[in-house]
Amino acid sequence: IIDGYKCKEGSHPWQVALLKGNQLHCGGVLVDKYWVLTAAHCKMGQYQVQLGSDKIGDQSAQKIKATKSFRHPGYSTKTHVNDIMLVRLDEPVKMSSKVEAVQLPEHCEPPGTSCTVSGWGTTTSPDVTFPSDLMCSDVKLISSRECKKVYKDLLGKTMLCAGIPDSKTNTCNGDSGGPLVCNDTLQGLVSWGTYPCGQPNDPGVYTQVCKYKRWVMETMKTHR
């Protein structure tokens, strides 16, 4: 997260880290005791999933292996359309005050809605600085019409933009797959942005979760 702040401890109990060995690979969101939602571009053969801690590499955090993941069938590596994936945990999480599932959206929030995005991604760009603490940024949803003025054809129909005018605050490498939460519901998954990160007036781009609720529910049901 560029130009963010340290999240209030325990305020994101649904936030998970997808680790490759013990290195951060991507963020993710707990949606069920067996399931983590993340970005399709975060796909690996297997994952070490850290839950229940705001510190990356926390020895006291729950760590669960995951060997199965289900990318949206329409995902494109080139255009990033349908950049959404479900990761099935090999064993169920132990729910607690530190580990909770996020609330999936009942509706799509409108432009102007205040939201918070979180992650352990680099806080500087192009030179990288990875924080140990979970970082947050407060952003507002931006209409597709406004966002298309910046990204033109790069912006797909199920992509959601968020940012703050004239501000550098944004997501960056390592934040991918993490949650954009608005009014206590999951509205976005970190998908992409301009590199180097933090270009003022270049919004962060997210997968618009409200458009995928049916796919999420059906995929979890199919692979129970």
Epitope: T77, P126, Y151, L154, T171, C172, N173, W192, P196
Partner: antibody, heavy 122, light 107 residues
Framework: QVQLQESGPGLVKPSQTLSLTCTVS??????????WSWIRQHPGKGLEWIGS???????YYNPSLKSRVTISVDTSKNQFSLKLSSVTAADTAVYYC??????????????WGQGTLVTVSS | DIQMTQSPSSLSASVGDRVTITCQAS??????LNWYQQKPGKAPKLLIY???NLETGVPSRFSGSGSGTDFTFTISSLQPEDIATYYC?????????FGGGTKVEIK
Amino acid sequence: QVQLQESGPGLVKPSQTLSLTCTVSGGSISSGGYYWSWIRQHPGKGLEWIGSIYYSGSTYYNPSLKSRVTISVDTSKNQFSLKLSSVTAADTAVYYCARAKQLTTHRYFDYWGQGTLVTVSS
Amino acid sequence: DIQMTQSPSSLSASVGDRVTITCQASQDIANYLNWYQQKPGKAPKLLIYDASNLETGVPSRFSGSGSGTDFTFTISSLQPEDIATYYCQQASDLPFTFGGGTKVEIK
């Protein structure tokens, strides 16, 4: 289809400034997510990234050339330019302009100009 | 700067042969690795991006693999039109850097 075309003098005297312009057609230079780059290739040698500019004017340069390089953009003309000062014979190369798709997820040079040979000689 | 070491610097193979080029980065670059083809007197052309993704319109005989520091570029069945120099390029960090190139010739 995006097309890039380099223009400028093919011969520059030592100690002078090399100036090249790249004209972009078939796409807007003001598109977010794309940087506009200069890359050079010494005769019979490999490729060297010189630097890139964003539509906003934000620039990134190769540290090995930074003290001598200026890249600018003119969005109204859909052009960007390279200036390389205090040139020597070692700056003789084919200069390419290119578009770089630069996202957090992937970054690559997808469109290139045909290149222009610049010779530094008195 | 990240150094990219490409090998071999040149190779000669017969039409129909499988050709393999390797590229090694001086530090971990995840999958931010691209491959380009350059024919004499022409600009480079993108073939593979993100280590393994084939650019639109590029024949499927070209492929790429690898992650971290070690990468491979393969032409499954060499064709006469594949005579060119091939370059790898890292896009993990600025400054972007290229390998020294591999010149591919037909025996």
